[in-house]
Interface confidence: low
Amino acid sequence: QGGTRSPRCDCAGDFHKKIGLFCCRGCPAGHYLKAPCTEPCGNSTCLVCPQDTFLAWENHHNSECARCQACDEQASQVALENCSAVADTRCGCKPGWFVECQVSQCVSSSPFYCQPCLDCGALHRHTRLLCSRRDTDCGTCLPGFYEHGDGCVSCPTSTLGSCPERCAAVCGWRQ
């Protein structure tokens, strides 16, 4: 039959596109295209992505899989989810560390490095908000400590000298 071929594929289902001469069924996620179909509405030859490579979407044209990313050890990143045939490695920060983005318009694919969370206990402070999107949020001084300058200082145990208000339970009141 003469004339130009219509770009629309008259095949059952909607997962067909013109590849080469014919409308072919595409490859599922996790597979790459080895060869297009050899008859109208036929199946393409698809192969599973090799180890350490992936393809996240159904496709009609990818003849190779994408290489899985390696988490940046220099940036203290760890793999939260290992790479599979259908998904890239998901890099993040280990417990006790938080994500510090390296770019301004930050999205999930933006480069980042991991920073250690502030240890409120080591600063003798209550933990008000656990470290997640940003650093730990430390609160007031723990019992037995009082605010002095920027830090928490251990309450005096002796009743000699002054006794800060927050330390009344430790060193008692003096007139």
Epitope: F98, C101, Q105, F112, L118, D135, D137
Partner: antibody, heavy 121, light 115 residues
Amino acid sequence: EVQLVESGGGLSQPGNSLQLSCEASGFTFSNHDLNWVRQAPGKGLEWVAYISSASGLISYADAVRGRFTISRDNAKNSLFLQMNNLKSEDTAMYYCARDPAYTGLYALDFWGQGTQVTVSS
Amino acid sequence: QPVLTQSPSASASLSGSVKLTCTLSSELSWYTIVWYQQRPDKAPKYVMYLKSDGSHSKGDGIPDRFSGSSSGAHRYLSISNVQSEDDATYFCGAGYTLAGQYGWVFGSGTKVTVL
């Protein structure tokens, strides 16, 4: 188009209160951290307060801590700054400014046009 | 918290070029900063972020005439082929987390006059 529109400014006496509002549109409000930044006449920019996307983390500048309260209503796409015990040094243009979404990034990528607060007896 | 130092003024001839400097306190020379442009009686506008390695990303609608670079604790904003609309005050700013508290500091601003 991202828009931030401040309101609620005006003339107030020392010791009085004002509440500023910032209405947001053109982006998913609940995904973004927000800040108030002020600018006294002829002076530079001074950060005032910060609130995280779900109000879980709030921070204030030393100059306003204990007097100002930042809050937000994600259902109404609104940011607020309750200003109590106003002082003459609070006189400034007040801007709301958006933090980009996602992780602990430091940027203020969109600003409102500002609302003027004047504290005078 | 970081301290950002800017010179108060700079001038540039029309179609010429100008380079603005923002200097971080030395112990925080690795900090990323942000440049803002504020035209008279207008709100600040995001120009770009600028990392310690000189990489940067500009905001929407910022012309190619604007570029950033870094050297040690210094962060630079360069404007080439200066236009009359570049007449503005340029602030650098840096966000930080200190003892669990998030905040911002800004430089005092550099007023650029286009001659």
